[in-house]
Interface confidence: low
């Protein structure tokens, strides 16, 4: 299947050229999304090319500056966010990256009423997390691990919490492992539908042992970098969660929400919170053996002014078969009655579906079924529910989006998208307004992508907000290489890969191949996406054929195939890459003498562990950040597939599934072995491992590090690391310079 | 800048009424409590009556069923209606803008409120 | 009600000296607590709230500490735009909300 744009052949063949390394450095060939920033039903907020930001009305067509690009830049102005009552602007600049998600900045407000920056009761700098209230302009803020509330921008700040310590207490905001590993987000606080509350997140690493690594700078002493990071079997993190009544905060001051018993009485995680009411609200549980979740509803109880958490709204998820959930337990979406609500679960086949659950989970009426998976509820309203699926054409790596019509009986379902562009669209996300009254679909590929705006009622695409023109008429003298996904059926499993072939493909040639793995749980590599990166230089201008294989252990094809890793990581993913290669070799078309294997992170270690199978089969690889030893790991993280790395749990497969274990395999394959020094999320100690243990068994290998740069090795290092491995490659694959 | 100017003070006689007023600019007095204090001359501060954003209102034990506190919002002013005067009731009465439902953050310069025969 | 009780009732202390005011309350307040700073003919100035946390505006040299029943308003050298009447007020319970008798710093 061919899912590039179809080009002109022969004539103009000459004219066009080959991709090179710096078109892809340079970003020469980069697309566009066009994602509104809603701010009603039919009103949103778009920053302009010149850096105005722009209000737009659909319905009046109309659109105007509420804040220029002056403004914006009389503080060095990075982002920007509207109060619910279009008062005030917050100007975010001095952006400072920490983790992931997390940053801090300068906050500058700045009142649209009299056009000036708010004066007097100034927001100390940096701060942490800063939200507007989603009703009026009230501010949260945090501000060195304390939680800071502003009834309004220029009055003095009420302190919520006081506890706070760097890396010992965190209050509304998660600590490395929280935000890395369970809620995926910068922040840890959440205010009520109309800001009536703000419930928040406390999480306690004074037990956590610290990971500790040099960060060399260009002092004459290194900085020592300490993080709270609880690796596998140790220490976890302590969490509790608050509520807080904002408009008369120290009345009773912040109440907590009592943890589920069955949850509590051993290890546990919050896993996220949702506001139901101003006077509702939901969190979800996790046990640290994650296998079972616990959904617990609690209610505002005026006369206590405290919450109250029924058992009788308690709602537990468990998998026998694996861990609850996918990467993370699903949310719900609550419906307009506040206690009903909609969820992504796993069906009695396997599947994750939507179920509604109205009283218990087990009396959830199943609303999706297949064997395909519902992988995302975007909105539900009074007659509508919408989602994403794999359903269409039985390709796991797209996405469509779907309505249902839930005001109806029996509800009807309707692809919104599977034909509005075939062939240049099977990969969406989308953006709803308020009330579904309009959406945005952002078009992914396998086409050039396309940001379009539609009518919710009718579903009319009503104009085109980006469609990258300027990309388009760039890529066309272009030599992009072609791209198939097809299927490989072994031992009744089924193995979807993504080829990448060079322009001038012939099958009766014989071509290098490089494996892009990835492969840990619940991921997908093989998707219906545009992307001009690395591997495509590499088969467009080099003549590699590139492929990418989802095995065992990915995301979107049923729990059969995603929990088969469950308590056995690094042996079913390697495997499956490898009976990959044998079925590409038997194609006819891949030269056996030169195949290599690359990974990143979690690809890093499969790619180490399949050079070191001992098949033969692969010539050379790279493993950039790989993990080593799950014992190094993330405790929330490794755990979940894991379990717990105890005698009495699975210390063997701990000590059975390291990199080192095997350094002996090494000898006969060419590995290069890549580590960014101050890596705080996959740590150093992985590569150094490897290092060490391939130098005691006296195995030659070349590696790189990178001083100073984390897990993305991003800026100039990037530059750097891609131009290496490229020579590496065609040193290993003898192709000239 | 946040600024409270109260007005309405007075010599009244013991029996009478008077109105206080108190104008705020600067900010929006309909989301925030409001509070009067009063302070007889030469002794320390009393908390008299306050109304909450909501509109719910408050008074000390001295002063209940005798003094309403009112508020109107277009016109950003607080209002303190005192009947049934009595001497006691002599005193520098304050508006201050209430913090959530805590402490007192902006004060007027106060009025003075005298009740003599 | 809760009563609060401020001691001395009068502080005489030179420029430049530390000044250590006392606020007791009849029972426990967490730390619901603010000070008030007060000079003749004028409105009161809100100094600390939560006990501890300083205003905006005022100077570092103003703290305060203290929780439960017992709490200090501690002034580190005294300026002389200090010697004032200073008021201590909880907002734990509430109506009313109570003020403590006042401690008056004077020039000795």
């Known amino acids: 299947i061919v899912l590039r744009p179809s080009r002109v052949h022969n004539s103009e063949e000459n004219t066009m050229r080959a991709l090179t390394l710096k078109d892809i450095l340079n970003g020469t060939f980069s697309y566009k999304t066009f994602f509104p920033n809603w701010i009603s039903g039919q009103e949103y907020l778009h920053q302009s090319a010149d850096n105005n930001i722009v209000l737009y009305n659909i319905e009046t067509g109309q659109s105007y500056t509420i804040l220029s690009n002056r403004t914006m830049k009389s503080v060095n102005a990075s982002n920007y966010g509207l109060s619910p009552d279009r008062q005030f602007v917050y100007l975010e600049s001095d952006y400072s990256k920490l983790w992931r998600y997390s940053y801090t900045a300068t906050y500058y407000i700045y009142d649209l009423s009299n056009g000036e920056f708010v004066r007097g009761n100034e927001l100390p700098r940096p701060i942490q997390y800063l939200c507007w209230s989603p009703v009026g302009s009230k501010l949260a803020y945090v501000y060195q691990n304390n939680i800071y509330l502003k009834q309004r921008p220029g009055d003095p700040p009420f302190q919520i919490t006081f506890n706070g310590r760097e890396n010992k207490i965190f209050n509304g905001i998660p600590d490395w492992v929280y935000e890395e590993e369970m809620l995926a987000t910068k922040y840890a606080l959440w205010w009520s539908p109309n800001g009536k509350f703000l419930a928040y997140a406390e999480f306690n690493d004074t037990d956590i042992p610290v990971i500790a690594y040099s960060y060399y700078g260009d002092e004459q002493y290194p900085r020592t970098i300490n993080i709270p990071y609880p690796k596998a079997g140790a220490k976890n993190p302590v969490v509790r969660i608050f509520i807080i009544d904002t408009t008369y905060p120290a009345y009773v001051g912040p109440q907590e929400v009592p943890v589920p018993a069955m949850i509590a009485s051993s290890d546990y995680y919050f896993s996220w919170l949702t506001w139901v009411t101003d006077e509702r609200v939901c969190l979800q549980w996790l046990k640290r053996v994650q296998n079972v979740s616990v959904l617990s509803i609690c209610d505002f109880r005026e006369d206590w002014q405290t919450w109250d958490c029924p058992k009788t709204q308690e709602h537990i998820e468990e998998s026998r078969t694996g861990w609850a959930g996918g990467f993370f337990v699903s949310t719900p979406v609550f419906s307009y009655d506040a206690i009903s609500y909609y969820k992504i679960f796993s069906d009695k086949d396997g599947y994750k579906h939507i179920h509604y659950i109205k009283d218990t989970v087990e009396n959830a009426i199943q609303i999706t079924s297949g064997k395909w998976e519902a992988i995302n509820i975007f909105r539900v309203t009074q007659d509508s529910l919408f989602y994403s699926s794999n359903e269409f054409e039985e390709y796991p790596g797209r996405r469509n989006i779907y309505r249902i019509s839930i005001g109806s009986y029996p509800p009807s379902k309707k692809c919104v998208t599977c034909h509005l562009r075939k062939e240049r669209c099977q990969y969406y996300t989308a953006s709803f307004s308020d009330y579904a009254k309009y959406y945005a679909l952002v078009c992914y590929g396998p086409g050039i992508p396309i940001s379009t705006l539609h009518d919710g009622r009718t579903d009319q695409e009503i104009k085109i907000l980006e469609e990258n023109k300027e990309l388009e008429n760039a890529l066309k003298n272009i030599q992009l290489p072609k791209e198939e996904i097809k299927k490989l059926e072994v031992d009744e499993i089924t193995l979807w890969y993504k080829m990448i072939l060079p322009p001038q493909f012939d099958r009766s040639k014989k071509y290098p191949l490089l494996i892009q793995v990835y492969g840990g749980p619940c991921s997908q590599s093989v998707r219906s996406v545009f992307a001009v990166n690395w591997i495509s230089y590499l088969a467009s201008k080099e003549g590699m054929v590139i492929a990418l294989v989802d095995g065992r252990g990915t995301a979107f094809q049923g729990d059969k195939l995603l929990y088969a890793v469950y308590r056995k990581l690094g042996v079913y993913e390697v495997e499956d890459q490898i009976t990959a290669v044998r079925k590409f070799i038997e194609m006819g078309f891949i030269d056996e003498k030169r195949i290599a294997i690359w990974g990143w992170s979690y690809g890093g270690y499969v790619s180490s562990l399949a050079l070191a199978s001992g098949t033969g089969l692969f010539k050379c690889g790279i493993a950039v950040a790989p993990v080593s030893s799950w014992e190094y790991y993330a405790s929330v993280y490794t755990e979940r597939f894991m379990g717990l790395p105890t005698k009495d749990d699975n210390l063997e497969h701990y000590k059975n599934s390291t990199v080192m274990a095997r350094a002996e395999y090494f000898r006969n394959v060419d590995y290069l072995l890549i580590h960014g020094t101050a890596d705080d999320n996959v740590h150093f100690q992985n590569s150094a491992q490897i290092a060490k243990a391939l130098v005691n068994a006296q195995v030659d290998f070349q590696a790189m590090w990178y001083s100073d740069q984390n897990h993305g090795l991003s800026g100039l290092s990037t530059n750097h690391l891609y131009t290496h491995m490229t020579h590496f490659l065609k040193q290993c694959f003898s192709l000239s310079d | 800048d946040v600024q409270l100017v109260e007005s309405g003070g007075g010599l009244v006689q013991p029996g009478g009424s008077l109105r206080l007023s108190c104008a705020a600019s600067?900010?929006?007095?309909?989301?925030?409590?409001m509070t009067w204090v009063r302070q007889a001359p030469g002794e320390g501060l009393e908390w008299v009556s306050g109304?909450?954003?909501?509109?719910?209102?408050y008074y000390a034990d001295s002063v209940k069923g005798r003094f309403t506190v009112s508020r109107d919002n277009s016109k950003n002013t607080l209002y303190l209606q005192m009947n049934s005067l009595r001497a006691e009731d002599t005193a520098i009465y304050y508006c201050a803008k209430t913090w959530g439902t805590e402490y007192f953050d902006y004060w007027g310069l106060g009025t003075l409120v005298t009740v003599s025969s | 009600e809760i009563v609060l009780t401020q001691s001395p009732g009068t502080l005489s202390l030179s420029p430049g000296e530390r000044a250590t005011l006392s606020c007791r309350a009849s029972?426990?307040?967490?730390?619901?607590l603010a000070w008030y700073q007060q000079k003749p003919g004028q409105a009161p100035r809100l100094l600390i709230f939560?006990?501890?946390n300083r205003a905006t505006g005022i100077p570092d040299r103003f703290s305060g500490s203290g929780s439960g029943t017992e709490f200090t308003l501690t002034i580190s050298s005294l300026e002389p735009e200090d010697f004032a009447v200073y008021y201590c007020?909880?907002?734990?319970?509430?109506?009313?909300?109570?003020f403590g008798g006042g401690t008056k710093v004077e020039i000795k």
């Open positions: 109304i909450r954003g909501s509109g719910t209102t």
């Open positions: 007020q909880q907002y734990y319970d509430w109506p009313p909300y109570t």
């Open positions: 600067g900010f929006s007095m309909s989301n925030f409590a």
């Open positions: 939560s006990a501890s």
């Open positions: 029972q426990p307040i967490n730390n619901y």
